[in-house]
Interface confidence: low
């Protein structure tokens, strides 16, 4: 058998909304993937287990089972949606989601997708892990890739 | 529309208990903070306490932390004080108020006339 | 615990004017997010207290825009222009900033 490829391309969109007296955000993210199916047969995307960390604090999970089934050399783009929570021990960033004195709230967050493909019976893992931006101070829409985070300075243009 | 039904007067014995009811109704009794307030005759307004219906999370004052349980049923949207050990200090209308998480107390219930008595 | 504070126990109008009521809260009201969580209420006699007023100058759903609030983190102002007979009651002030939420003492409009 061929590869199947899993490209994680960032995130989509975030949504967030707060709860004032808890002193808690929660962001509902949007992943985008690339599934790429390399073989000559049809392979099934069964299922998508995601999971979002803060600051080495696991925020949010999700799960999405049977979710589609890819033809041969064929390419599938999937989105999913992990709600988050930052509370408790992390409500300190309440502050600095809130705080309308600078434009940009931005997070970075680690994103951990798996996705597990089956054909034939034969079922394969797939495990992705990626830094990324998140502007947890309003609703954002993101180009595709806009989100990413790199672990260089970048010079000022 | 929206609307908290609480009953009119409670008469009890001092040293006993009493669990005052507020009924919600008219939106989504999960989405809003239900607080209670009291105000004894002639005196202005305390806070007592908050409590989420979504997962009973609470606050007290911590004046009342030891008078006031705060409870909700959410098959019947009903949130629920009881005040125990009841003395004469205690009588006093008390008030069961809404609140989403940015906008406070924007719709109150009538109030409950507790009279604590012998 | 934040102590707010309602000077004047009570205010005289004559119909038609405007009347001032003051507040004032022993630490800011302030929060970084831009919102000062400062609410004003009215309760008229015999009935269950009213939101006029909330984060400081927001004007509630319903009420008359002859209503304002004002202020800075910690002095609060709220202002009745053409007071009417039925803005009778007293008007109480409360921060929702930190737990316990607290309330001033009140202030109780009259008509002269």
């Known amino acids: 058998p061929r590869s199947i490829d899993v490209k994680y391309i960032g995130v989509k969109s975030a949504y967030v909304s707060y709860d004032v007296q808890k002193r808690t955000i929660y962001l509902n993210i949007t992943n985008t993937l690339n599934i790429t199916n390399n073989n000559y047969y049809s392979v099934e995307v069964e299922n998508i287990t995601a999971q979002v960390q803060f600051s080495k604090t696991v925020i949010g999970k999700a799960r999405l089972n049977n979710i589609t089934i890819i033809g041969p050399l064929d390419m599938k783009q999937i989105d999913y949606t992990v709600p988050t929570v930052i509370a408790e021990e992390m409500s300190y960033m309440y502050d600095f989601c809130t705080l309308i004195s600078i434009k940009v709230h931005n997070i970075v967050l680690m994103m951990q997708v798996t996705v597990t493909t089956t054909y034939f019976g034969h079922s394969e893992q797939i495990s992705q892990e990626r830094y990324q931006y998140v502007d947890c101070g309003r609703n954002t829409t993101y180009q595709l890739g806009q989100s990413e985070y790199l672990n260089v300075l970048q010079p000022q243009q | 529309q929206v609307q908290l039904q609480q009953p009119g007067a409670e008469l009890v014995k001092p040293g006993a208990s009493v669990k005052l009811s507020c009924k919600a109704s008219?939106?989504?009794?999960?989405?809003?903070?239900m607080h209670w307030v009291k105000q004894r005759p002639g005196q202005g307004l305390e806070w007592i306490g908050n409590?989420?219906?979504?997962?009973?999370?609470?606050h007290y004052n911590q004046e009342f932390k030891d008078k006031a349980t705060l409870t909700v049923d959410r098959s019947s949207n009903t949130a629920y004080m009881q005040l125990s050990s009841l003395t004469s200090e205690d009588s006093a209308v008390y008030y069961c108020a809404r609140s989403s998480n940015w906008d406070n107390f924007d719709y109150w219930g009538q109030g409950t006339a507790v009279t604590v008595s012998s | 615990d934040i102590v707010m504070t309602q000077a004047a126990p009570s205010v005289p109008v004559t119909p038609g004017e405007s009347v001032s009521i003051s507040c004032r809260s022993s630490q800011s009201l302030l929060h970084v997010n831009g919102h000062t969580y400062l609410y004003w209420f009215l309760q008229r006699p015999g009935q269950s207290p009213q939101l006029l007023i909330y984060r400081m100058s927001n004007l509630a759903s319903g009420v008359p825009d002859r209503f304002s609030g004002s202020g800075s983190g910690t002095v609060f102002t709220l202002r009745i222009s053409r007071v009417e007979t039925e803005d009778v009651g007293i008007y109480y002030c409360m921060q929702h900033l930190q737990y316990p939420f607290t309330f001033g003492s009140g202030t109780k409009l009259e008509i002269k």
């Open positions: 008219g939106y989504t009794f999960t989405t809003f903070w």
């Open positions: 409590i989420d219906p979504s997962d009973s999370e609470t």
